[in-house]
Interface confidence: low
């Protein structure tokens, strides 16, 4: 079973709902850890979650709590939570099996559904989490070999491979 | 009864639930009808409906239907459907009671709070609405009638002449 | 809303007032300055359009009271020239809404124009 | 021109209390009462003639259309002692009533 993996409830089937619900451009700031997007998750995951909830946090902030149904403030609330156990999670298993990356994350904007993209794809880094064998894959380099990622696009680092 | 009241329906009660579901920081574009600011709603509202029905209709395409509860997407299409009502009650009533600016409409930028506030005054102009007995209160001049205007100064008039 | 600039003046003198603005997008409301003499009612003195193209006055201040804004700052001004005891009064800003007339008014800012 | 009555009136907490504004010319629903306490900003409680101010206590009410307006407070209470003024805003100048004083009998 993935590190973490049972922080991580069925919440974020909502994100469906939110990204409808909100203006497709609309922009939302993430601190994006470089390499995300060609490196293995244990490279970044420990470094984006801490992002992410930053991100949430200043999200929810932008809506106000109305009791009624699946608001956006619910959801993104309980997003938030999520994503606050993870970051406690990580802290446990900061000395074990996961990276922090050497470089400053870079603040970006992100429509919702980039953001949210990069948001799913992190929450299912700690679904399919393995142990790590080696270091030496956390280096991000030019000749990385189009088997190792081939649906990466290195034009655009900030677009994500689809996500599964 | 107002003009047009009839075509006031409850849904602008949703209202508050869209504006709770907005993003605070996230802005509306809207062509704001110069003289809204300090002349009475029967020199703007035909001009402003049509705005706000130009607005809403852009907002809407910004959100995903989904068919799930009061989503955004189904409040705004409830909204540009009162709002366009409107627009036609005002076609019908264009050559009686209410006026139309010279001024062209500057685009602004409204958060969703101060955008509704705007939607909502703007239907409660309806609501309220009495018939205009004259036409000189939709000019801000000095060569109004002495009982109303002999203490007033006006360096640039805020509007042309209204149309009839 | 909240203004500054008052004090004491002689007759003749001349004062400007600023009404620093925040919570609300400023460049899309009309604001006015409206004074309250001691003891007395309240008097509307001035009025500015959004976009500050547009000023209007009292004939009691006109030629004298200039008002002006900028919106980059989110300040209202008011700039009163050749002052006489009659201005005497608590100056006032007021946002002024589409409907609600003078919803938000500032604590006000005592000018007192004596020799 | 705005004309208030009375200027002046004394009434205990509880009481009804009915202030009333006149306008020299029809100005319509353009009409705002505010309430002014010593020493403070006055605050709207009323605008178009009737419709309440957010986060205005519901006792306070207003009626009225073309020239004849009124102010009403259901029951008194402490905190409403103060001056009620009305204001109209047709076209220019914005002009204000002299005021109402509600005192405490």
């Known amino acids: 079973e993935g590190i973490c993996r049972n922080r991580v409830t069925n919440n974020v089937k909502d994100v469906t709902k939110l990204v409808a619900n909100l203006p497709k451009d609309y922009m939302i700031t993430l601190k994006y850890v470089p390499g995300m997007d060609v490196l293995p998750s244990h490279c970044w995951i420990s470094e984006m979650v801490v992002q992410l909830s930053d991100s949430l946090t200043d999200l929810l902030d932008k809506f106000s709590n109305i009791s009624e149904g699946l608001s956006n403030y619910s959801i993104i609330d309980k997003l938030v939570n999520i994503v606050d156990d993870l970051v406690e999670c990580v802290k446990e298993n900061s000395s074990k099996d996961l990276k922090k990356s050497f470089k400053s994350p870079e603040p970006r904007l992100f429509t919702p559904e980039e953001f949210f993209r990069i948001f799913n794809r992190s929450i299912d880094a700690f679904k399919d989490f393995v142990v790590a064998s080696e270091t030496s894959d956390c280096v991000v380099s030019s000749t990385l070999s189009p088997e190792k990622d081939s649906r990466v696009s290195v034009t655009k680092p900030f677009m994500l491979p689809p996500v599964a | 009864e107002g003009i047009c009241r009839n075509r006031v329906t409850n849904n602008v009660k949703d209202v508050t639930k869209l504006v709770a579901n907005l993003p605070k920081d996230y802005m509306i574009t809207l062509k704001y009808v110069p003289g809204m600011d300090v002349l009475p709603s029967h020199c703007w509202i035909s001009e402003m409906v049509v705005q706000l029905s130009d607005s809403l209709t852009d907002l809407l395409d910004k959100f995903s239907n989904i068919s799930e509860g009061l989503s955004n997407y189904s409040i705004i299409d409830k909204l540009v459907n009162i709002v366009d009502d409107l627009v036609e009650c005002v076609k019908e009533n264009s050559s009686k009671d209410l006026k139309k600016s010279f001024k062209s409409p500057e685009p602004r930028l409204f958060t969703p709070e101060e955008f509704f506030r705007i939607f909502n005054r703007s239907i409660d102009a309806f609501k309220d609405f009495v018939v205009a007995s004259e036409t000189s209160d939709c000019v801000v001049s000095s060569t109004l009638s002495p009982e109303k205007d002999s203490r007033v100064s006006v360096t640039k008039p805020f509007m042309l002449p209204p149309v009839a | 809303l909240v203004e500054s600039g008052g004090g004491l003046v002689q007759p003749g003198g001349s004062l400007r007032l600023s009404c620093a603005a925040s919570?609300?997008?400023?460049?899309?409301?009309?604001m006015s300055w409206v004074r309250q003499a001691p003891g007395k009612g309240l008097e509307w003195v001035s009025a500015i359009s959004g976009s500050g193209g547009s000023t209007y006055y009292a004939d009691s201040v006109k030629g004298r009271f200039t008002i002006s804004r900028d919106n980059s700052k989110n300040t209202l001004y008011l700039q009163m020239n050749s002052l006489r005891a009659e201005d005497t009064a608590v100056y006032y800003c007021a946002r002024r809404d589409f409907f609600a007339h003078f919803d938000v008014w500032g604590q006000g800012t005592l000018v007192t124009v004596s020799s | 021109q705005m004309t208030q009555s009375p200027s002046s009136l004394s009434a205990s907490v509880g009481d009804r209390v009915t202030i009333t504004c006149r306008a020299s010319q029809g100005i319509r629903g353009y009409l705002g009462w505010y309430q002014q306490k010593p020493g403070k900003a006055p605050k709207l409680l009323i605008y178009?003639?009737?419709s309440l101010q957010s986060g205005v206590p519901s006792r306070f009410s207003g009626s009225g259309s073309g020239t004849d307006f009124t102010l009403t407070i259901s029951s008194l209470q402490p905190e409403d002692f103060a001056t009620y003024y009305c204001g109209e805003w047709l076209s220019m100048p914005y002009t204000f009533g002299q005021g109402t004083k509600v005192e405490i009998k």
């Open positions: 178009s003639a009737s």
């Open positions: 919570g609300f997008t400023f460049s899309s409301y009309a």
